[in-house]
Interface confidence: low
């Protein structure tokens, strides 16, 4: 299963920690509980990962397959334009926003959406697999 599929959550895959999903060269963690954006970021950093930064449309559509209607925080902020948490620009997707105070990004199965950073949402962490 681990070799044969593009992604896997199987227990026998040694390259990602328990409760993390492997896809390509990365491990992903989908939270169950909810936190505000900065607390979600700190949760990920404490586990040698970062709040999800998506590299392309292919990765985005794969991840959306795992999501429901519920929004999850990603490492995206509006700081003179929408940028990922490492500083790189968002350039393969648009983000929906209806307020200037919505400066943090979240994803669900359908879209990227701006939200107030103080809202409690689930989140996704990402790290390079060992």
């Amino acid at each position: 299963l681990c070799q044969g599929s593009k992604y896997s959550t199987c227990a026998s895959c040694p390259s990602c920690p328990d409760h993390w999903m492997k896809y390509g060269n990365h491990c992903y963690y989908f939270s169950v509980e909810k936190k505000d954006w900065i607390s979600s970021l700190e949760f990920c950093l404490a586990r040698d990962s970062h709040l999800l930064m998506i590299t392309d449309k292919q990765e985005m559509s794969l991840l959306q397959d795992f999501l429901s209607e519920a929004f999850h925080w990603v490492g995206l902020r509006n700081n003179s334009g929408w940028r990922w948490e490492d500083g790189s620009p968002l350039n393969f997707s648009r983000i929906y926003s209806n307020s200037l105070v919505q400066t943090c990004g979240a994803i669900n199965k359908n879209s990227l959406q701006a939200s107030s950073c103080e809202v409690s949402l689930q989140w996704v962490c990402k790290k390079v697999s060992p």
């Epitope: 950093l45 590299t55 392309d56 700081n79 490492d86 500083g87 790189s88 620009p89 390079v128």
Partner: antibody
Framework: QVQLKQSGPGLVQPSQSLSITCTVS????????VHWVRQSPGKGLDWLGV???????DYNAAFISRLTISKDNSKSQVFFKMNSLQADDTAIYYC??????????WGQGTSVTVSS | QIVLTQSPAIMSASLGERVTMTCTAT???????LHWYRQKPGSSPKLWIY???TLASGVPVRFRGSGSGTSYSLTISSMEAEDAATYYC?????????FGGGTKLEIK
Amino acid sequence: QVQLKQSGPGLVQPSQSLSITCTVSGFSLTTHAVHWVRQSPGKGLDWLGVIWSGGNTDYNAAFISRLTISKDNSKSQVFFKMNSLQADDTAIYYCVRLLLPAMDYWGQGTSVTVSS
Amino acid sequence: QIVLTQSPAIMSASLGERVTMTCTATSSVSSTYLHWYRQKPGSSPKLWIYSTSTLASGVPVRFRGSGSGTSYSLTISSMEAEDAATYYCHQYRRSPYTFGGGTKLEIK
């Protein structure tokens, strides 16, 4: 282990360009950004620019007109080119890996003197 | 841009002495993105403390980082000879990413 090895000239003529290659090992350029920082005696440490894992670049506004950063993922190499160097560009130039939340590993530095 | 001012620029301490240096930012920096680097002559800077207070791998526990908002500090509980170096603070919150001017720590 993570390493960034730099190669480039030590002496550059005024108005000429500087090219430095940063060859990395122990990590992939497809998953990590590489920044460039210089250290000059008079000005301390200055951030110059970055090439992101996806290939996009950002530059310090003070250098944007004469700086180009590119890379070859398959060769694990990052290329730095700065044009129109003057005496005050004399500095040690570093390539640096980004591992959020910080720049964690630095190259050994390329000492550049701009002089005729 | 965010300007980081370090003080003092140069300081000397006796072995065993407690040492504190500060880093002040012109606007608020998230503590997650305030870091300290140590540099010895002839060497590249090394990540020393990240996210305000987390020690990088191999850093002795006598080092401690603290602060929030615009004011941060690095403290050495008991100065040792190997601690003589220049320490730089750095913010990775907002581009252009900036560094402090450094604090050179010497042995008295």
